[in-house]
């Protein structure tokens, strides 16, 4: 199985959760895209765009927005207000079965925690941006998890320095977290794909 | 190893037609679309259209200045790109490399090496 | 169409200096903070080389003495410590819209 490094990200409650996938296929444009958790081994379905995916037209499940742009290969997440409950690994996909999914990125490990007492972050409409880039050929089921970087939601007018492959980039006010992770290369993701692909359609014509 | 290869390139009277070709090989070449970008002797680069893959219809798209004269079409069986280039003018003398994206709208990362097309009486 | 203006349009710089070029355009290339805007490199009888993509990110072999910021319509190239290889024309280009576009170059030379 092709090893997947989780990210771990940490909220309050009340927090919003914001995650650009990028998916860059053509070949994905199309497609239903779709954002789930992990719960043990199986990923429960908890947002999917419509098929065919039209651009920047919003899909709402309860505090779920999902909003595709198809012509441009990226697809935005938002998990509105936050609660302990919603802690747990999610993976944005491209969905074509249930069983079927492709993994688009490393999952996120979300951890939502109680805003302390006193501190009027706690039920705060803050906004953490996570981009996300495909880095993986793993099917949604059963990859093998590495030990989680962990990035914390920082105070007002701090900054955060996130690590990417040949830069640093200094964030103020966590407006962006980019992360660009290469795994292995786009090529083998895209031969990766194109073969399932080719076996799903031999399999169902 | 990713490779993009032009050909066709020559000496046309003005109102003359010429193809190029763009061979690829290296990657699955169904998967992206592909660009036409030229560079007349001396100046900056133009882009000068591209063409998407079969999941969008072979979608094309094209610069101003040779909108209705120029077509690009691509053969996924041969691996091929092609520029068809119609009424040509003498402001289309240029190098004309072909070029292939990293995906929906991303930056192009391989290059031919370019093919010279001159158009002269 | 957007229009990319790069400034200077010719720059000399001393060898270990800091050379910088701005690439403005006419509307913003962004899409989901997502900006569109790429930078190469080229030098004479080759074709362009791609050193910079989607703004900031350093594409993959290329030297991290070169950098990219900037977002919406204002983007900078940088060069932190100029080298002889670095002599060449740089160009910006936008994929955001079409049809693409490129800036008119800046020339980069040794002082």
């Known amino acids: 199985t092709t090893e997947l490094t989780e990210e771990k990200y940490e909220y309050k409650e009340g927090q919003t959760l914001e995650v650009k996938c990028d998916y860059t296929l053509e070949k994905f444009a199309s497609s239903q895209k779709a954002w789930q958790k992990m719960e043990g081994k199986m990923p429960k379905i908890l947002a999917k765009t419509e098929r065919p995916s039209k651009n920047s037209h919003p899909v709402q499940v309860g505090r779920i927005t999902l909003e595709d742009y198809p012509d441009h290969g990226l697809l935005q997440v938002q998990m509105t207000n936050l609660q302990v409950e919603d802690s747990g690994l999610y993976q944005c996909v491209i969905y074509q079965h249930p069983k079927e999914s492709h993994v688009l990125f490393n999952p996120i490990c979300l951890v939502v925690t109680k805003g302390s007492s006193g501190t009027p972050g706690s039920s705060e409409n803050s906004t953490q941006n996570v981009y996300r880039t495909p880095s993986t050929t793993a099917k949604a089921l059963g990859p093998r998890y590495t030990s989680p970087r962990t990035v914390t939601q920082a105070p007002p007018e701090s900054t955060v320095v996130v690590s990417t492959p040949g830069s640093e980039i200094n964030l103020t006010n966590v407006t962006d977290i980019i992360r660009e992770q290469k795994l292995i290369s786009e090529e083998d993701l895209e031969q990766k794909l194109i073969s399932e692909e080719d076996l799903h359609h031999h399999h169902h014509h | 190893e990713v490779q993009l290869v032009e050909s066709g390139g020559g000496l046309v009277q003005p109102g003359g037609s010429l193809k190029l070709s763009c061979a690829a090989s290296g990657f699955t070449f169904s998967t992206y679309a592909m660009h036409w970008v030229r560079q007349a002797s001396g100046k900056g680069l133009e882009w000068v259209g591209r063409i998407r893959t079969k999941s969008s219809n072979y979608a094309t798209y094209y610069a101003a200045s040779v909108k209705g004269r120029f077509t690009i079409s691509r053969d996924d069986s041969k691996n091929t790109a092609y520029l068809q280039m119609n009424s040509l003018k003498t402001e289309d003398t240029a190098v004309y490399y072909c070029t292939r994206d990293m995906g929906i709208r991303r930056q192009f990362a391989y290059w031919g090496q370019g093919t010279l097309v001159t158009v002269s009486s | 169409d957007i229009v990319l203006t790069q400034s200077p349009d010719s720059l000399a710089v001393s060898l270990g200096e800091r050379a910088t070029i701005n690439c403005r355009a006419s509307e913003s290339v962004d899409t989901f903070d997502y900006s569109f805007l790429h930078w190469y490199q080229q030098k004479p009888g080759q074709p362009p080389k791609l050193l910079i993509y989607?703004?900031?990110n350093l594409e993959s072999g290329v030297p991290d003495r070169f950098s990219g910021s900037g977002s919406g319509t204002d983007f900078t190239l940088t060069i932190s410590s100029l080298q002889a290889e670095d002599v060449a024309v740089y160009y910006c280009q936008q994929s955001n819209e079409d049809p693409y576009t490129f800036g008119q170059g800046t020339k980069l030379e040794i002082k």
């Open positions: 989607r703004a900031s």
